[in-house]
């Protein structure tokens, strides 16, 4: 048999080998496709099947607009002018090339040593489903489940039967200072069909380094509070992913669960002291904030104690 590949919506003509080009002809076309349950013999006189498969005067079979349900086997049996029986057998597959794939929600930059979502590659309207592949600097990226992670999703349209593919790429770049170029390609896996490529995206990789700033905010401002009052300490860090935050009082760690906020309700003199927060990042060591002083006083009219937070209520690391 012969394998035939036809584009969805396009006409297809299958020739009946051995059939005389003009009537009288002795021939029989039969098909077994998604429209049939078994073999369907087509009437030479034509009929309701003509809209999907029609016998032409020269004995060939015309499929005016191939669809997914027309995939299957087509057979012709003809008797030639010399009375010899000739058989033709075709295996028909259909395809649809999707629109150009796109990288949606691309990253603006990447951070070395931590997982980064590069973007999601989307291809819409393919048949069969096909595959999406990622490329780094023009070379095929093979997901290893560690430094290179790909999350794939395939959906089929309930009416058209066409596929939408999504592929989300996450990478852990090893070093900063580089400018890798990522692209994605769609392939139907058919012979003589070149892959469709997205426009490439070039991203800067920066070293994680310390966060740009770790600030300790105190409420009330100045860190002076009357007995029974409440003090709120907030450790503000501009780092992704958010690090774990521990608290230190007078140089000793406080036995509390990690949290960027420390609440001291109904303070007494035992809560007085110097507080700081320590942020621990996965990619580098712990980082401590500047300290703030908490004073509990009856009058509340004293100025800031030495070493306490100034007017802004912020302790900023230079």
């Amino acid at each position: 048999g012969q394998n035939i590949t036809a584009r969805i919506g396009e006409p297809l003509v299958l020739s009946c080998k051995g059939a005389p080009k003009k009537p009288p002809q002795q021939l029989e076309w039969k098909l077994n496709t998604g429209r049939t349950e078994a073999w369907k013999v087509l009437s030479p006189q034509g009929g309701p099947w003509d809209s999907v498969a029609r016998i032409l005067p020269n004995g060939s079979l015309l499929l005016p607009a191939t669809g997914i349900v027309d995939e299957g086997t087509f057979r012709c049996r003809a008797t030639n002018r010399r009375g010899k029986e000739v058989k033709s057998n075709y295996r028909v597959r259909v395809y649809q090339i999707p629109g150009k794939p796109e990288i949606v929600d691309p990253a603006s930059e990447l951070t070395a040593s931590v997982p980064n979502k590069v973007g999601t590659c989307v291809s819409e309207g393919s048949y069969p489903a096909g595959t999406l592949s990622w490329h780094l600097d023009g070379k095929l990226l093979i997901p290893d489940g560690k430094e290179t992670l790909v999350k794939e999703e395939t959906r089929r349209h309930p009416e058209t039967g066409l596929f939408t593919l999504r592929s989300e790429l996450t990478v852990i770049p090893t070093q900063g200072g580089t400018h890798p170029t990522f692209s994605c390609s769609f392939s139907l896996g058919l012979p003589r069909r070149r892959p469709l490529n997205t426009a490439p995206i070039q991203l800067r990789v920066r070293e994680p380094g310390p966060p740009e700033g770790i600030q300790l905010l105190v409420e009330p401002e100045g860190g002076i509070v009357a007995p029974g009052g409440t003090v709120t300490l907030t450790c503000a860090i501009s780092a992704q992913p958010p690090p774990q935050v521990h608290w230190i009082k007078d140089g000793a760690p406080l036995p509390l669960a990690p949290s960027p906020v420390l609440l001291l309700p109904e303070v007494g003199h035992e809560d007085e002291g110097t507080y700081s927060c320590v942020a621990t990042h996965p990619s580098h060591g712990p980082q401590e904030s500047p300290p703030v002083s908490i004073r509990v006083t009856e009058t509340g009219d004293e100025g800031p104690a030495e070493g306490s937070v100034g007017e802004s209520g912020l302790g900023t690391l230079a």
Epitope: G46, S51, V52, R54
Partner: antibody, heavy 119, light 107 residues
Framework: EVQLVESGGGLVQPGGSLRLSCAAS????????MTWVRQAPGKGLEWVAS????????YYPDSVKDRFTISRDNAKNSLYLQMNSLRAEDTAVYYC????????????WGQGTLVTVSS | DIQMTQSPSSLSASVGDRVTITCRAS??????VNWFQQKPGKAPRRLIY???NLADGVPSRFSGSRSGTDFTLTISSLQPEDFATYYC?????????FGGGTKVEIK
């Protein structure tokens, strides 16, 4: 909304001719085969003719072949049935319907037009 | 030509009854059978297409089934508006052939 409206029915003498029309709206006319079906008074339904979407291919039962001609004008979204050599047994309500092939078969019908063949 | 033998030609039933109408094709027609409902003075209305599929806007009490060349229309619980004549149609081959019809009357 799909609408099919037949016209052209009436009283005609045996041996006479009549042309029925069907005006289609609410769908892309040239995407569909079209069909005429008739129903004699108090009787069942009988297929009369079908035409493919381009109008290139027409189909008839033996009872009307060579007497009736189905045609279409896709620019006007119209279907026609030219009936010649009419006989008393052609008396019926004639319906136009959308489809007639294996993809879509008679999913929408017109209200019908009565043809009476009598002397 | 294909014959579509429809039975019964008429039946009497009450509201709430389960009603079954059958069409037998004289040769294999695959799934290419429709069912229609017709009320006096009105055009036929398609109920079931390709043997088992419910047409748009048709109540779910109507269903179609197939076993080889036997096709069945079932009304699970007959309603007052269901008293009408029902036809099957084969559209696998020309000439397109309708069954003779089944008139469903009030008992």
């Amino acid at each position: 909304e799909v609408q099919l409206v037949e016209s052209g029915g009436g009283l005609v003498q045996p041996g006479g001719s009549l042309r029925l029309s069907c005006a289609a709206s609410g769908f892309t006319f040239n995407n569909y085969w079209m069909t005429w079906v008739r129903q004699a008074p108090g009787k069942g339904l009988e297929w009369v003719a079908s035409i493919d979407n381009s109008g290139d291919n027409t189909y008839y039962p033996d009872s009307v072949k060579d007497r009736f001609t189905i045609s279409r004008d896709n620019a006007k979204n119209s279907l026609y049935l030219q009936m010649n050599s009419l006989r008393a047994e052609d008396t019926a309500v004639y319906y136009c319907a959308r489809g007639g092939d294996i993809r879509v078969s008679l999913d929408h019908w017109g209200q019908g037009t009565l043809v009476t063949v009598s002397s | 030509d294909i014959q579509m033998t429809q039975s019964p030609s008429s039946l009497s039933a009450s509201v709430g009854d389960r009603v079954t109408i059958t069409c037998r094709a004289s040769q294999d027609v695959g799934i290419y059978v429709n069912w229609f409902q017709q009320k006096p003075g009105k055009a036929p209305r398609r109920l079931i297409y390709r043997a088992t599929n419910l047409a748009d806007g048709v109540p779910s009490r109507f269903s179609g089934s197939r076993s080889g060349t036997d096709f069945t229309l079932t009304i699970s619980s007959l309603q007052p508006e269901d008293f009408a004549t029902y036809y099957c149609l084969e559209f696998d081959e020309h000439p397109l052939t309708f069954g003779g019809g089944t008139k469903v009357e009030i008992k």
